[in-house]
């Protein structure tokens, strides 16, 4: 690697993937193994993230970018950059601080993560229940008796799933 020549800061010419080595007259040296620098002009390289335990490697570390982790089967990511792996539950359950618990009557969860959500209240839309809800599925709303004329829409899709705002323990 060339010795840098910037008049202001000789380190500013060191590209990503290198660091400005004070021990070698501020020569741009490549990042050592298992480290990276994502921007130029850095005086040190950062240690690569290691994906261990229930974390697994989604993207390997390179000299210019950190490793990225996701979670092993049975767990899912939470937090920025997958800072946590949270245990999956079965459909029809939610994770509480005490572990996976069945959804209470009147609520459902159709995913392995997230919280139990209330069944859709069909009557709010002037509709009737076409298919009853379960722990795993929302109710299916059908037309109200007044709407049973030909060509009427018969099904209202369930509300989209939303993510939990917390991570229980």
């Amino acid at each position: 690697f060339e010795r840098t020549r910037s008049l202001q800061d000789p380190c500013s010419n060191c590209p990503a993937g290198t660091f400005c080595d004070n021990n070698r007259n501020q020569i741009c040296s490549p990042c050592p193994p298992n480290s990276f620098s994502s921007a130029g002009g850095q005086r040190t390289c950062d240690i690569c993230r290691q994906c261990k335990g229930v974390f697994r490697t989604r993207k390997e570390c390179s000299s210019t970018s950190n490793a990225e982790c996701d979670c092993t089967p049975g767990f899912h990511c939470l937090g920025a950059g997958c800072s946590m792996c949270e245990q999956d539950c079965k459909q029809g359950q939610e994770l509480t601080k005490k572990g996976c618990k069945d959804c209470c009557f009147g609520t459902f969860n159709d995913q392995k993560r997230g919280i139990c959500r209330p069944w859709t209240n069909c009557s709010l839309d002037g509709k009737s229940v076409l298919v009853n809800g379960t722990k795993e599925r929302d109710v299916v709303c059908g037309p109200s008796p007044a709407d049973l004329s030909p060509g009427a829409s018969s099904v209202t899709p369930p509300a989209p799933a939303r993510e939990p705002g917390h991570s229980p323990q």
Partner: antibody, heavy 120, light 112 residues
Framework: EVQLQQSGAELVRPGASVKLSCTAS????????MHWVKQRPEQGLEWIGR????????EYVPKFQGKATMTADTSSNTAYLQLSSLTSEDTAVYYC?????????????WGTGTTVTVSS | DVVMTQTPLTLSVTIGQPASISCKSS???????????LNWLLQRPGQSPKRLIY???KLDSGVPDRFTGSGSGTDFTLKISRVEAEDLGVYYC?????????FGGGTKLEIK
Amino acid sequence: EVQLQQSGAELVRPGASVKLSCTASGFNIKDYYMHWVKQRPEQGLEWIGRIDPEDGDTEYVPKFQGKATMTADTSSNTAYLQLSSLTSEDTAVYYCTPYSNYVYWYFDVWGTGTTVTVSS
Amino acid sequence: DVVMTQTPLTLSVTIGQPASISCKSSQSLLDSDGKTYLNWLLQRPGQSPKRLIYLVSKLDSGVPDRFTGSGSGTDFTLKISRVEAEDLGVYYCWQGTHFPHTFGGGTKLEIK
């Protein structure tokens, strides 16, 4: 960054009470059980119990029932451990940790520890 | 309460040599959800404990691959393939399956 900062060392008289604090940053304590662990000088680790800061629900090891009281204040993101009727047996370092069986953080988190010395 | 028995009490090992610590529980640590909540912690002198291994064999981030955890039911082992100077301290097993949670008595690893 996820951290747990515990209150400073305490020198207290026998029979007195003391309240220790454990303040979290980088996460909400209401989302986790906060556990307290005791370590007497040159001894091993002893689990005291845990609190659910969301509703104040507590579980104690029977031997600490009446001796220890765990509370939490979610507005200040702080868990507390009060120790009463102190004796020399309570001289120890006390740690807090948000241990979980179901959520694994990229880094395990323990408090810095608070040293309690009971002496007349 | 579940009693966690660790052996040996003290382990004196030459740097570069292997080490093994045993932890036996008085009841099975297999939970009804099929998981075994057995952790290994290391407490270095003057520091807070730090978890090394959870769920019997899962290494925490930053823990070198020379550490391995194994076992099931009531018998668990922590192995260090080649001990390094930074490994000295007291090792504890900790079960989170049964209430109350309990720790082993600790194994002090000394460097010869």
